[in-house]
């Protein structure tokens, strides 16, 4: 769900780490409506997901993880 | 009615390391996570960290990275966390706590009763 | 060292109101979900508000969240003998990315 760029909701779908490739922070305050998280996949679909739920933060941690450690 | 089920107490001497285990009885581990919460002797609560068995893969707190592996068995509804390189200082209660990980209720919603384990030389 | 900030203790008599505060940061309380945990000594906590303000099934209506900011409160009104407990306030943190408990309050049903 989105539009020129912005995330307008959320996915109401889990999805798996191992069809993310990387994610990208939407702020409210930087010219969309919502916070999100947009991740990437190997599909190259764009996701747009709710920061605040727990699958959402445990991906957005592991591929933080996979970036600091190449 | 879904219960967490923790293994029983452990006495443990310094070096060494423990693993308990949490067995989801009555329900299973799906579209839930799993996490790890220590409290020391007339301490707070603390968070070790967590899985999510669909994904296969834990978040450590930062605190433990390192010393602390947790893993999942979902055709058993298991999981397990396992603390390394034990001090004194690990002498706590550890519980086990499910998460629903869609965030209708975004909270630990079920704790197991806790596992003592007491490290002394 | 947890960055929830909660008083050690607050005290009141029966059939009052008391009001637990809950001290963050943007990372933490400011972005995210809180939730509220009751602990009897000798036993494991037990979640009594979750998303600041929603009571799970079978927790009395007389324990409200709420949250301003950074920070996020925990009112429990008409106060009752088994209400005494420690009181613990949770929240992912962003920045950690990793979950946090308050530092834990003291209640005593004087």
């Known amino acids: 769900a989105s539009n020129f760029d912005c995330c307008l909701g959320y996915t109401d779908r889990i999805l798996h780490p191992k069809f993310i490739v990387g994610f990208t922070r939407q702020l409210a305050n930087e010219g969309c409506d919502i916070n999100a998280i947009i991740f990437h996949t190997k599909k190259k679909l764009s996701v747009c997901a709710n920061p605040k739920q727990t699958w959402v933060k445990y991906i957005v941690r592991l591929l933080s993880k996979k970036v600091k450690n190449m | 009615e879904v219960q967490l089920v923790q293994s029983g107490a452990e006495v443990k001497k310094p070096g060494s390391s423990v693993k308990v285990s949490c067995k989801a009885s009555?329900?299973?581990?799906?579209?839930?996570?799993i996490s790890w919460v220590r409290q020391a002797p007339g301490q707070g609560l603390e968070w070790m960290g967590g899985i999510i068995p669909i994904f296969g893969t834990a978040n450590y707190a930062q605190k433990f990275q390192g010393r602390v592996t947790i893993t999942a068995d979902e055709s058993t509804s298991t999981a397990y966390m396992e603390l390394s390189s034990l001090r004194s200082e690990d002498t706590a209660v550890y519980y086990c706590a499910r998460e629903d990980i869609v965030g209708a209720v975004d909270g630990f919603d079920i704790w197991g009763r806790g596992t003592l384990v007491t490290v002394s030389s | 060292q947890s960055v929830l900030t909660q008083p050690p203790s607050v005290s009141a008599a029966p059939g009052q109101k008391v009001t637990i505060s809950c001290s963050g940061s943007t990372s933490n309380i400011g972005n995210n979900y809180v939730s509220w945990y009751q602990q009897h000594p000798g036993k494991a906590p037990k979640l009594m508000i979750y998303d600041v303000s929603k009571r799970p099934s079978g927790v009395p209506d007389r324990f409200s969240g709420s949250k301003s900011g950074n920070s996020a409160s925990l009112d429990i009104s008409g106060l009752q003998s088994e209400d005494e407990a420690d009181y613990y306030c949770a929240a992912w943190d962003d920045s950690l990315s990793e979950f946090l408990f308050g530092t834990g309050t003291k209640l005593t049903v004087l």
């Open positions: 009555g329900g299973t581990f799906s579209s839930y996570a």
